[in-house]
Interface confidence: low
């Protein structure tokens, strides 16, 4: 019996031994994608579906509220600035927008998990694309912030201040454009699909196995590994420079950005490790069995929930780590509550150091 994963990939003896019981190591080949036959049957999803039904709607609802409030507050604070936004603030504003748009899709996914997808194929494509656009945008914008800091501090190059203010906007547009490109498969392949086994309709991909694996690899690399590597590289160099210059104030100013990067890593690493296991199963490097698949499905639900938590985490980090954000937020609340008290509308200082709540004239983070 010939055991092949696809026309291009033949299993080796070790993999054949592991998969001897099955016709194929993976069960999701499209009719035109691979000429292999016949597949292992889809696994029963009772446990993972029941888990999702109980766990996801509650989590998504909570994240929706927290994310909307938190990121709304960040956007409000940034947009209430009288002066032009600094490069980092602009990136943070875009990050808040990305996080807000992502959490806006969560109620739809909560309904999908609790009951079924009742919103049709059009909204399935839009919600899926919106979700992924903002997943990628969040990671890439954090990488942009770290690269901006790196240029400013390590190379003393104020890329976005020397050139026209439009440069940071162009960078953000490039990020959004790239994310839109990454989300093309969502627009093309996502649809509301009726699952006969579950007797329910769900918003899911309908494309060949190789495409699914490629998309997961893209998500892993472009949405996690690359941004994380950029962040790690940039901040390692920044910290080295600051330690050498013994800039205690500047080191203190780096607190927020280090915490934001650590939060990104902590929130998304578990999910991407699970995705990696899934990729390995897709490729046949790990034998696929129903027990493992069920555990991976549940792990994916839990770790993706942790990942989406990151959308709500940034505002909280700003609030608890960033002194200036608290000041600005407090002032904004007072201004909204007491519109007649003109004294409260006054900016604390017109100096460049206070013109932003994330940057200082020394091109590092302020005390926040």
């Amino acid at each position: 019996m010939v055991l092949e994963v696809s026309d291009h990939q033949v299993l080796n003896d070790a993999e054949v031994a592991a998969l001897l019981e099955n016709f194929s190591s993976s069960y999701d080949y499209g009719e035109n994608e691979s000429d292999s036959c016949c597949t292992s049957p889809p696994c029963p999803q009772d446990f993972s579906l029941n888990f999702d039904r109980a766990f996801l709607p509650a989590l998504y609802s909570l994240l929706f509220l927290l994310g909307l409030l938190g990121n709304g507050a960040v956007a409000a604070v940034l947009l209430s600035r009288r002066t032009a936004l600094s490069s980092t603030d602009t990136f943070l504003l875009h990050l808040a927008v990305a996080d807000t748009l992502l959490v806006l899709t969560l109620p739809l996914w909560a309904v999908d998990a609790a009951v079924q997808w009742v919103f049709g194929s059009g909204l399935c494509k839009v919600a899926g694309a919106l979700f992924n656009i903002n997943f990628y945008a969040g990671a890439l914008l954090l990488a942009c912030i770290s690269f901006d800091r790196y240029l400013n501090i390590v190379h003393a190059t104020q890329l976005y201040r020397r050139g026209p203010p439009a440069r940071v906007t162009l960078t953000c547009l490039a990020v959004w454009g790239l994310c839109l490109l990454f989300a093309l498969p969502d627009f093309i392949f996502l649809s509301a699909h009726h699952d006969e086994r579950l007797n329910a309709t769900h918003c899911q991909y309908n494309f060949p196995q190789v495409g699914r694996t490629a998309l997961r690899v893209l998500q892993l690399v472009a949405g996690f590994l690359l941004p994380l590597l950029v962040m790690a590289y940039c901040y390692a160099h920044i910290l080295a420079v600051l330690l050498v210059s013994r800039g205690q104030r500047r080191l203190r100013a780096m607190r927020l950005v280090v915490v934001v990067v650590v939060a990104f890593a902590l929130c998304w690493t578990p999910y991407h490790l699970v995705v990696l296991v899934d990729i390995l199963m897709d490729l046949g490097a790990l034998a696929r069995n129903c027990g493992r698949e069920s555990r991976v499905d549940v792990a994916k639900s839990v770790t993706s929930g942790l990942g989406y938590m990151h959308c709500c985490l940034n505002p909280l980090l700003y609030a608890f780590v960033g002194v200036k954000f608290r000041e600005r937020m407090w002032m904004l609340l007072l201004r909204l509550g007491c519109p007649n008290q003109r004294g409260l509308q006054r900016q604390p200082s017109s100096s460049r150091r206070d013109s932003s709540w994330s940057e200082t004239s020394e091109a590092s983070y302020s005390g926040l």
Epitope: G30, E31, D35, C38, S40, P44, N206, F207, P208
Partner: antibody, heavy 123, light 106 residues
Framework: EVQLLESGGGLVQPGGSLRLSCAAS????????MSWVRQAPGKGLEWVAT????????YYPDSVKGRFTISRDNAKNTLYLQMNSLRAEDTAVYYC????????????????WGQGTLVTVSS | DIQLTQSPSFLSASVGDRVTITCRAS?????LYWYQQKPGKAPKLWIY???TLASGVPSRFSGSGSGNEYTLTISSLQPEDFATYYC?????????FGQGTKLEIK
Amino acid sequence: EVQLLESGGGLVQPGGSLRLSCAASGFTFTSYAMSWVRQAPGKGLEWVATISHGGKYTYYPDSVKGRFTISRDNAKNTLYLQMNSLRAEDTAVYYCARHPIYSGNYQGYFDYWGQGTLVTVSS
Amino acid sequence: DIQLTQSPSFLSASVGDRVTITCRASSGVNYLYWYQQKPGKAPKLWIYFTSTLASGVPSRFSGSGSGNEYTLTISSLQPEDFATYYCQQFTSSPYTFGQGTKLEIK
């Protein structure tokens, strides 16, 4: 309407050969994996061979491996089973059957069957 | 190979009876598939993915089970239900069928 029509059955001596054909109509033959399943008189069903939709991959149980060869001609919408070194225990009604596609995946059960052709191996 | 054992092999029942056919697997299977066959005819897909009725199958039929034990139940037997029923697995190669359960009129 999906139709599968087997032919080529008959009486053959032990050690002899026979080639069965299955003419398919009513569906896009090139998109489906196909199989042969047999049923000895008064007995249960036994899977004999499977071929992928493009004809590149074939699968057999140990009982017929090396003796039977499944093939297809997608241009003619026809499935074949070449049976060599026939034994008395190969006597059965041979059905050709279609594998369904579920969510883009080939499934190992059979959604349509032909009426069968009887193969008798006897001296 | 996974062996499928159906019980009973023969079953005599009357119209209106509730009938249950069991299929036991020698090792766990993910799903089970059921076929109906009438004398001189080709088998017909009856139930797939353990519990999904094939097109045209009356709702009095139901399938259930998991792991090693699966059942096909007919809530109220009708004259056209008298036939032989086979279970099948394709969790592992080779595809195997049960020996069949012949349902006869009492």
